[in-house]
């Protein structure tokens, strides 16, 4: 919950290894807390996918478009 | 325990030129965003630059942007900034701080001077 | 940019005292807020994340309200302790601190 007293985590990781697809991230992250907007200094953090802002991490995490992946979504999926 | 530790700081004349760097231990620092914030002596909190991650994205506040460029070397868990163009105004203490968004951990800082 | 503005800039306390320090963003900023406390030499350490969210090891003392553009800081029980300066910062678009609130013994 985004309420609790544990670390935000501010930074943490977005993906779990950088060749992993963030979409499974944001996966994952759903059992920590819920999403909102991404802040705006992060609007163009993923190259091609949207942004959710993790609130429990206070971190923010891409969510790619079909056919790519990456941190910020900024590899074609060769096995897509 | 989380460590942030600055170093490279020192007199330097304007226009002249800076390499701040910043060890970290005590968590995987290839796991996060790193931040640089600066504090003029006596003064509030301004926020500098900072990457992300794996160190493919970055930003800068206004005042050091196409002067100062931020860095990170995950090898060797360290966070750099590379301060050129110095003017007056940059002279602060610099503290590396972990996160992109908020700051849950800083250095004890290292104090930037530029004078003449 | 987003400014911040916090009132505010200095007040003086009794310990046991109830304390409030206010800050206005000058626009919209839904709850991306922190508050943070800096005592003399020393780095900030951070309080208060998400505007109401208290740091892990922070005294429940310390809480946080607001969202949108006004958001306030209290301080339910003033201890020895917590005479220092405290900053709010806002983190929707890039990072902005308000100028400070230095909290002083009456």
């Known amino acids: 919950d985004g309420n609790s007293t544990r670390s935000p985590e501010t930074n943490g990781l977005l993906c779990g290894d950088p060749e992993e697809n963030c979409a499974a991230t944001t996966t994952q992250s759903k059992r920590k807390g819920h999403f909102s907007r991404c802040p705006k200094q992060y609007k163009h953090y993923c190259i091609k996918g949207r942004c959710r802002f993790v609130v429990a991490e206070q971190t923010p995490s891409c969510v790619c478009d079909e056919g790519y992946i990456g941190a910020r979504c900024e590899r074609v999926d060769l096995f897509y | 325990q989380v460590q942030l530790l600055e170093s490279g700081g020192g007199l330097v004349q304007p226009g002249g030129s800076l390499r701040l760097s910043c060890a970290a231990s005590g968590f995987t620092f290839s796991r996060y965003w790193i931040s640089w914030v600066r504090q003029a002596p006596g003064k509030g909190l301004e926020w500098v630059s900072y990457i992300d991650s794996w160190g493919s994205y970055t930003n800068y506040a206004d005042s050091v942007k196409g002067r100062f460029t931020i860095s990170r070397d995950n090898s060797k868990n360290t966070l750099y900034l590379q301060m050129n163009s110095l003017r007056a105004e940059d002279t602060a203490v610099y503290y590396c701080?972990?996160?992109?968004?908020?700051?849950?951990?800083w250095g004890q800082g290292t104090l930037v001077t530029v004078s003449s | 940019d987003i400014q911040m503005t916090q009132s505010p800039s200095s007040l003086s306390a009794s310990v046991g005292d109830r304390v409030t320090i206010t800050c206005r963003a000058s626009q919209g900023i839904i709850s991306y807020l922190g508050w943070y406390q800096q005592k003399p030499g020393k780095a900030p350490k951070l309080l208060i994340y998400?505007?109401?969210s208290l740091q892990s090891g922070v005294p429940s003392r310390f809480s946080g309200s607001g969202s949108g553009t006004d958001f306030t800081l209290t301080i339910s029980s003033l201890q020895p302790e917590d005479f220092a300066t405290y900053y709010c910062q806002q983190y929707d678009d890039f990072d902005t601190f308000g100028q400070g609130t230095k909290v002083e013994i009456k």
């Open positions: 998400a505007a109401s």
């Open positions: 701080a972990r996160g992109g968004s908020l700051f849950d951990y």
